[in-house]
Interface confidence: medium
């Protein structure tokens, strides 16, 4: 069954703070003011203890105090919700702004930034109201830390929920050449602007970015689904002139051994401006980082209508090959290769242990938690287990 790229609009489920499917043991903090304001009291809409997590130290001027939620498995986190301290309705402490940091392995932490590089998120204006923040771009994380901020010495307290879904692809990182700039009547910036890994010597590695965010580019690569972004935003692109080999090579690292049925690459084909589908794709497979590539590469030649300028998802059969690492070469068939999304259809190989530290217990694809209820700022579908939807004009 060749599924399409995952749809971020359907990935907005409560991940378990409010309904307690995230256990107390998975909620921790840098410090707590007292046991009654410990990390376990940070559940959205909960009145446990003194009604929130409150750090022991000041968050001004240093912003070092954090609340940590361990989701135990990789999730795509699309929204977060925050509240201040309940305290039987008498709480006065809340956080007007905060930052997020996240990790996929518990070792390397990344700061969340919006599409324009802004890290600080507007929080609450009072202790009781819930403020939802749509995370654009969403983050793929196992661990999430909330760092409350203040503009003066004051007490801040926090209750939170995370919304998203299990990161079913299992993709931990991709390595690719840095995207380039196409010069038309205006510059078209085809870089991976949300990549959260490292960039060294023209190569990006160790992270995820726009090629795994669920946002599929338009037929005209100069236009975008996003507001207030630059031309080319949705695509990552490379010029044939820069690759004497005639191909762009990418490597993909997964959480555990998987049997790969297919790779889906959403490509631009606006040939009047130089963008072409790849002429072919060649993928190699290996089970570990220091192991040899196994067997013959899978080769797939692409046909179809060359005169058809529609962007499209190219499906590359991978024959059920088992691996944790894939290296794929995308052959140029024209001046430019432009990709907006790459996803994989695969099955976890039974008894394969995860690549990350710790064990990941089984978790459903759709987490069991319902979306938050009775928020004036939300429009919700009538039953639990439905995605949360952020209303137009609600606070960010």
């Amino acid at each position: 069954d060749m599924k399409g790229h995952f749809d971020p609009a359907k990935c907005r489920y409560a991940l378990g703070m409010q309904d307690r499917t995230i256990p107390d043991s998975d909620i921790s903090a840098s410090s707590s003011w007292s046991d009654s304001t410990a990390a376990r009291h940070s559940r959205l809409e909960s009145s446990d203890g003194d009604g929130a997590w409150c750090p022991a130290g000041s968050v001004f001027p240093k912003e070092e105090e954090y609340l940590q939620v361990d989701l135990q498995r990789l999730h795509l986190v699309a929204l977060v919700g925050t509240q201040g301290r309940h305290a039987g309705g008498l709480g006065k402490e809340f956080s007007r702004s905060y930052r997020l940091r996240y990790s996929r392995d518990g070792r390397r932490w990344m700061g969340w930034k919006d599409r324009w590089g802004q890290e600080v998120i507007s929080g609450n204006e009072d202790p009781e109201g819930v403020v939802l923040k749509d995370l654009g771009p969403p983050m793929v994380a196992r661990l999430v830390r909330f760092y409350p901020r203040a503009d003066r010495v004051m007490s801040v307290c926090l209750r939170v929920e995370l919304y998203g879904c299990l990161w079913r692809d299992g993709l931990l990182s991709y390595t690719a050449p840095v995207g380039q700039t196409m010069y038309l009547s205006e510059a078209v910036y085809l870089n991976d602007s949300t990549y959260d890994g490292h960039t060294v010597g023209g190569l990006q590695y160790g992270g995820l970015g726009q090629l795994a965010d669920g946002v599929v580019g338009l037929d005209d690569f100069r236009k975008s689904q996003e507001l207030r972004v630059w031309p080319g935003y949705d695509y990552v692109g490379w010029s044939n002139h820069s690759f004497s080999s005639g191909y762009v090579e990418m490597e993909f690292e997964f959480d555990r051994l998987r049997a790969f049925q297919a790779m889906q690459v959403h490509c631009n084909n606006m040939h009047t401006l130089g963008a072409r589908l790849p002429g072919g794709v060649e993928c190699r497979f290996r089970r570990g980082p220091a192991m040899a590539w196994e067997g013959e590469p899978m080769r797939h030649n692409l046909g179809g209508n060359l005169g058809d300028p529609r962007a499209r998802a190219v499906s590359v059969p991978l024959g059920g090959r088992v691996a944790r690492f894939l290296q794929c070469r995308f052959l140029f068939a024209g001046p430019w290769l432009l990709f907006s999304e790459i996803s994989f259809i695969s099955d976890v190989v039974n008894n394969s242990s995860p690549a990350l530290g710790g064990t990941f217990p089984p978790a459903p694809w759709w987490p069991p938690g319902p979306p938050p209820t009775n928020f004036s700022s939300l429009e919700l579908e009538p039953r639990g287990q439905q995605p949360v939807a952020k209303a137009e004009g609600s606070p960010t």
Partner: antibody
Framework: QVQLKESGPGLVAPSQSLSITCTVS????????IHWVRQPPGKGLEWLVV???????TYNSALKSRLSISKDNSKSQVFLKMNSLQTDDTAIYYC???????????WGQGTSVTVSS | SIVMTQTPKFLLVSAGDRVTITCKAS??????VVWYQQKPGQSPKLLIY???SRYTGVPDRFTGSGYGTDFTFTISTVQAEDLAVYFC?????????FGGGTKLEIR
């Protein structure tokens, strides 16, 4: 909201030509592509032609010599012309849009064309 | 041009039944297959694109699968409002040909 509406003559004499207009609203012809598809009475669908957002065209080769397609982006209109009509060209003619799903996601209600003397 | 052979031509089913329609392409069309529903007196409506991706708002009882030359469209639990003709179409190479259609009738 997205809408497409076909308008045509209804009745055409054999060997005459047919002109149909598709007027769209709710989206721009500079960003989306418009196809023409026809359906003879009680039969299946036949794809005729597409005009891409940039104005380029792709025709069904079996009908290419009799078809021409054009558009006016500013008026949000697409025009189909078909020459030398015969009775087996009697059909409902639909215009449809393709956007970001590589498929025809919105269709007009169709205009019925009867070729008869 | 690519020929899309759709079977069966007619299906007579009861509400609650599971229905499967197949489409076979005369050559590989990757996963560029689309399924449409056309109710009596109406224009076609998009249900499935890229062989298996459900279009926005389409109930999850409608599913598609397949790759290359063989494609399947399934209605898991037929409802009375599913009375319609269903068409497959290859969107791989022009001319973008349709299957002959399957008329679904409810007992």
């Amino acid at each position: 909201q997205v809408q497409l509406k076909e308008s045509g003559p209804g009745l055409v004499a054999p060997s005459q030509s047919l002109s149909i207009t598709c007027t769209v609203s709710g989206f721009s012809l500079t960003s989306y592509h418009i196809h023409w598809v026809r359906q003879p009475p009680g039969k299946g669908l036949e794809w005729l032609v597409v005009i891409w957002s940039d104005g380029s065209t792709t025709y069904n080769s079996a009908l290419k010599s009799r078809l021409s397609i054009s558009k006016d982006n500013s008026k949000s209109q697409v025009f189909l012309k078909m020459n030398s009509l015969q009775t087996d060209d009697t059909a409902i003619y639909y215009c449809a849009r393709t956007g970001n799903f590589y498929a025809m996601d919105y269709w007009g209600q169709g205009t019925s064309v009867t070729v008869s003397s | 041009s690519i020929v899309m052979t759709q079977t069966p031509k007619f299906l007579l089913v009861s509400a609650g039944d599971r229905v499967t329609i197949t489409c076979k392409a005369s050559q590989s069309v990757s996963n560029d297959v689309v399924w449409y529903q056309q109710k009596p007196g109406q224009s076609p409506k998009l249900l499935i694109y890229y062989a298996s991706s459900r279009y926005t708002g389409v109930p999850d009882r409608f599913t598609g699968s397949g790759y290359g030359t063989d494609f399947t469209f399934t209605i898991s639990t037929v409802q009375a409002e599913d009375l319609a003709v269903y068409f497959c179409q290859q969107d791989y190479s022009s001319p973008y040909t349709f299957g002959g259609g399957t008329k679904l009738e409810i007992r």
